[in-house]
């Protein structure tokens, strides 16, 4: 079934209460426009945003009988000429008579007649109509023949994109058959289709078809009011392509539209081949879109690649929500032209600062006021991380200008990074030299403390991403952050007692649920000693508050529980509800405190792994005093398992080199590549592809290269655990930019800068160590439990 037939069937269903063969039509209030009712229009009770009234009429081909419900009688079948009268196209019938077409369409043959309605003839330009009436034997006859096809074609045969030769000089009739059931012929809508005749079929259309001999290019070249667009099309080498065969829709901005553009914008775009071509292509669709087919908002891909939304408000057509079409449906032999009074500028032709919307004006105004806009060169590449207007508090806005400038610099990157280029663990450098971390979650992407909202765009010289908050790069480690806040003094002392201070100082990615002193309310000094006395218990409790990976509260999908594995080994349950983070159903007092090696979420209760029993009465009593949200299990005699701290402690002990490294003499400025052979490393990371996070597994080759420079340095690497104290000679030269560790039982990862610095110490020339020795470094944490 064709779209037309489907919509007709829906209209029939909606009208069946009124009797047999009744169709429900919707008429736009204040107009004579009627449409068979589609499901969408029926429920909306509107077409093109205008209210409709429901009319019940006989479905095509049926008629009423006196005293009977509905339309029980079938319309009489007649030849095409007689059928024109049956469907009420009496003006077309009269013209067919006077032009001597009558005998043709009463006689032998099979015809399709696209018959203009009486109203269509009334709407025709009076000069054109007079011209036809003054020359009925030639001009009128030719005009009527151009509405006819030499065979019977029902709506099901009128396929989208078809060009049918008419009976006048084989001039093409452009058929479009849209999913909303609208069928058009040279953009005239079929308002009553499929009226079968003995020698063909009649379709009533809503306007008189004018002869088409020109292409879009021809029209542009002839129309003075489109000279700006024409010139721009020439500049962009596009004018000739609009003369080729196709089914284009051109939204052609008039000269007046170009006059509305700020001159500077026009001068920049016209001076940039890529931008001017994008601008022009953004006005062209590769499909033919007649105005009559637009009954609601729909998105169309332009030749430029981005989309435009075409909608309607009554008789007006809107583009991207703005009413701007002032002349519709200029049909040419390769498409249709709609004249518009605004120039459409695609994102790809805009400067990065122009990509900001109404919700980012505070940011863009500040960028301009503080002189940062001038540093965004048209031929450069940048990324703006633009916070929404309400992210800027009054306090922020009243800051010292120099401070404010530094804050803004944290929101501009030196390179163009699109949404699909972002991945978890990525480091981005700002124009101020600060480094920002990217965190990719299931339904969110965050940079430092701030998460993105919809609306990322790519422009000519950069990209823009929209953020909920001002981005604040971390300055301090987890340990330093806790130390500077008195609320965490008890937790910090316990941490140090458990020998875990280093863990929160060294580089890494952690999420710490930090209990405030309130969590230890009522704990006596004796009880504190009891807790400290059982180091395994203390470590288990503290490490239950620490999870590998950075989990930002705002990155959580609202209302969904995220199960993470803690460093202690048990699971912890996180949920974001109404801007609040719930940790094991306990409300976090403050969340997303960023640090250089992780994030802190503040809790005012001590957390405890529900699956771990306690075997000591006194400890149970203490824990029950502090922890109320769960029932702690008691199993007499059970002890806390020891958590091997080597897992988290950096320790360079052994190094494996299969075969000797090659060394050669190097000249000043030359780079040495030292090849260390080892096992392949499987690396996993998340990357956003087309807006969807995808986990990518990368297998690194057996050859890991250490890129080094010309200045020779010596590095002493001591072995531990009763080894013979052998070291490696000339291990690294100059500054190592990237070193890959091979870790037994873990995945390969890159050293942090701090680790590299620690490696590059010592100057004792060393003896060569035998092959097949291993580096037993810090075991890389598992990524299990990353459920965000």
């Amino acid at each position: 079934n064709s779209y037309y037939d489907k919509v007709l069937a829906h209209s029939r269903i909606r009208g069946r209460d009124q009797g047999p063969n009744v169709c429900a039509l919707q008429q736009i209030l204040g107009t004579k426009k009627k449409y068979f009712s589609s499901c969408k229009n029926w429920y909306q009770g509107a077409i093109c945003g205008k209210k409709t009234t429901v009319l019940y009429e006989c479905c095509p081909g049926y008629m009423r009988m006196e005293g009977m419900k509905g339309c029980p009688a079938v319309m009489p079948i007649d030849h095409v000429y007689g059928t024109l009268g049956i469907v009420g196209a009496t003006t077309t019938q009269h013209y067919s008579d006077v032009s001597k077409l009558r005998e043709e369409i009463e006689g032998k043959g099979s015809y399709t007649y696209f018959a203009p309605s009486n109203e269509a003839w009334e709407n025709l330009d009076s000069d054109i109509r007079r011209g036809l009436e003054n020359n009925v034997n030639v001009e009128l006859l030719n005009a009527l023949h151009s509405h006819m096809v030499n065979k019977r074609m029902l709506t099901k045969d009128l396929k989208h994109g078809m060009v049918i030769p008419s009976m006048y000089n084989n001039l093409g009739l452009f058929i479009n058959h849209y999913p909303n059931g609208v069928v058009t012929v040279n953009c005239a809508r079929v308002i009553h289709g499929n009226q079968i005749a003995t020698n063909g079929v009649v379709h009533v259309i809503d306007r008189v078809l004018t002869q088409i001999g020109t292409s879009i290019q021809d029209f542009l070249e002839a129309e003075d009011d489109l000279s700006s667009f024409r010139a721009a099309a020439i500049t962009s080498d596009l004018l000739e392509s609009l003369g080729r065969d196709g089914h284009f829709t051109l939204f052609a901005p008039t000269n007046e539209a170009f006059e509305k553009l700020p001159r500077g914008v026009l001068e920049r775009i016209m001076g940039d081949k890529v931008a001017s071509e994008a601008l022009m292509k953004y006005h062209i669709l590769n499909t033919l879109q007649c105005s009559e087919a637009i009954t609601g908002g729909a998105v169309f891909e332009t030749m430029e690649g981005n989309t435009i939304e075409i909608g309607c408000e009554g008789d007006s057509i809107s583009i991207n929500g703005i009413k701007m079409v002032n002349k519709k449906d200029i049909v040419t032999k390769n498409g249709v032209i709609h004249l518009i009074d605004e120039v459409l500028i695609p994102d790809s032709a805009k400067q990065v600062i122009e990509l900001a919307g109404k919700q980012q004006t505070t940011f863009t105004d500040l960028v301009a006021q503080l002189g940062l806009a001038s540093s965004l060169k048209p031929d450069g590449e940048y990324t703006l991380l633009a916070p929404v207007n309400n992210a800027f508090s009054d306090d922020t806005l009243s800051m010292d200008q120099r401070l404010l400038k530094l804050i803004l610099q944290n929101h501009i990157l030196k390179v163009k990074v699109g949404l699909s280029d972002l991945y978890n663990g990525q480091i981005l450098e700002t124009i101020g030299g600060k480094q920002l971390r990217v965190f990719v979650y299931r339904t969110a992407i965050c940079i430092e403390n701030s998460c993105m909202v919809r609306g990322s765009k790519q422009g000519r010289n950069g990209a823009i991403h929209i953020f909920r908050e001002i981005i604040q790069p971390a300055e301090k480690s987890l340990h330093d952050k806790l130390r500077q806040d008195k609320r965490f003094s008890i937790f910090l002392s316990l941490l140090e007692a458990a020998d875990l201070k280093d863990l929160l100082t060294q580089p890494g990615d952690w999420t710490l649920f930090a209990p405030t002193n309130d969590a230890f309310k009522g704990m006596t000094s004796e009880e504190r000693e009891l807790l400290i006395g059982d180091k395994n218990a203390l470590q288990n409790i503290i490490l239950y508050h620490l999870t590998p990976g950075v989990y930002i509260g705002k990155g959580f999908e609202p209302g969904v529980t995220n199960i993470l594995k803690t460093t202690q080994g048990s699971k912890i349950y996180l949920k974001g509800v109404n801007e609040t983070l719930l940790v094991n159903e306990l409300k976090s007092k403050e969340s997303d405190i960023m640090t250089t090696n992780g994030v802190i979420h503040v809790v005012d209760k001590l957390l405890y792994p529900a699956d771990i029993p306690v075997g000591n009465d006194q400890l149970l009593e203490l824990l029950n005093k502090l922890i109320k949200y769960i029932q702690i299990k008691f199993v007499r005699g059970s002890t806390f398992k020891e958590i091997p701290m080597t897992v988290y402690r950096p320790a360079m002990t052994k190094i494996q080199i299969e075969g000797d490294p090659d060394f050669r003499l190097i000249k000043e400025g030359e780079t040495v590549t030292e090849v260390i052979h080892g096992e392949p490393v499987i690396k996993k990371y998340t990357k956003i592809i087309d807006g969807v996070p995808v986990e990518i597994t990368e297998k690194q080759t057996r050859e890991e290269r250490i890129i080094t420079g010309p200045e020779i340095k010596y590095t002493r690497i001591s072995t531990g655990g009763g080894e013979t104290g052998e070291t490696l000679q000339k291990f690294l030269q100059k500054e190592v930019s990237k070193v890959t560790k091979f870790i037994e039982g873990g995945d390969g990862h890159l050293f942090e800068d701090e680790e590299i610095k620690r490696l590059l110490q010592g100057d004792t020339p060393a003896k060569k160590i035998p092959a097949n020795k291993r580096v037993q470094g810090p075991r890389r944490r598992s990524r299990e439990g990353r459920s965000q």
Epitope: S227, E259, G264
Partner: antibody
């Protein structure tokens, strides 16, 4: 063919005003803007401003803001430029040019010499 | 004083190629297109090149324009005596919100 015909030469005293006309033919006047450019004797060109013949919108050079007014009369397809508070350094040949924006100043008038002298 | 800088004169013999240069800043040529105008002695200027390298119809292909960074140039190949004129470059200046011209280069055919 496109033609822009300007009014004749003027001699004015300092402090006076001058109004130069520019009659367009050979194209649809309201489809294009008009820019005014002046050239002091033996000097380069200086853009004075632009007017939309369709809407009457204007864009004046900062330097002349407050002293210059550009207008159009669509019924006669004529553009006008009035310069007030004339000074001796306003002595120049004043040109009107059709300004399509996309193709700037594609046709020029023959020029009007305005001499400001006491 | 002109915002765009042009060499005051250039010359060549018939048939030669002469290049006229025009230098600006990031707020004019660096950000926007360059247009070139020819002014024959005693006449009004005429548009020669627009949008850096586009020739209006009627302008011979002996004239070509190019732009790189904050400077632009006009090349006249196959120099003819009829090419003897003043040549002006022009661009929009974002900081001044004004259309600015170069000081002009007088091309002489020897």
């Amino acid at each position: 063919q496109v033609q822009l015909v300007q009014s004749g030469a003027e001699v004015k005293k300092p402090g006076a005003s001058v109004k130069v006309s520019c009659k367009a033919s050979g194209y649809t006047f309201t489809s294009y803007g008009i820019s005014w450019v002046r050239q002091a004797p033996g000097q380069g060109l200086e853009w004075m401003g632009w007017i939309s013949a369709y809407q009457g919108n204007t864009n004046y050079a900062q330097k002349l803001q407050g002293r210059v007014t550009m207008t159009t009369d669509t019924s006669t397809s004529t553009a006008y430029m009035e310069l007030r508070s004339l000074r001796s350094d306003d002595t120049a040949v004043y040109y009107c040019a059709r300004d399509m924006l996309v193709v700037p100043f594609d046709y020029w008038g023959q020029g009007t010499l305005v001499t400001v002298s006491s | 004083q002109s915002v765009l800088t042009q060499s005051s004169s250039a010359s060549g013999t018939p048939g030669q190629t002469v290049t006229v240069s025009c230098s600006g800043s990031s707020s004019d040529i660096g950000s926007n297109r360059v247009n070139w105008y020819q002014q024959l002695p005693g006449t009004a200027p005429k548009l020669l090149i627009y949008s850096n390298d586009q020739r209006p119809s009627g302008v011979p292909d002996r004239f070509s324009g190019s732009k790189s960074g904050t400077s632009a140039s006009l090349a006249i190949s196959g120099l003819q005596s009829a090419d003897e004129a003043d040549y002006y470059c022009a661009a929009w200046d974002d900081s001044l919100s004004t259309y600015v011209f170069g000081s002009g280069t007088k091309v002489t055919v020897l």
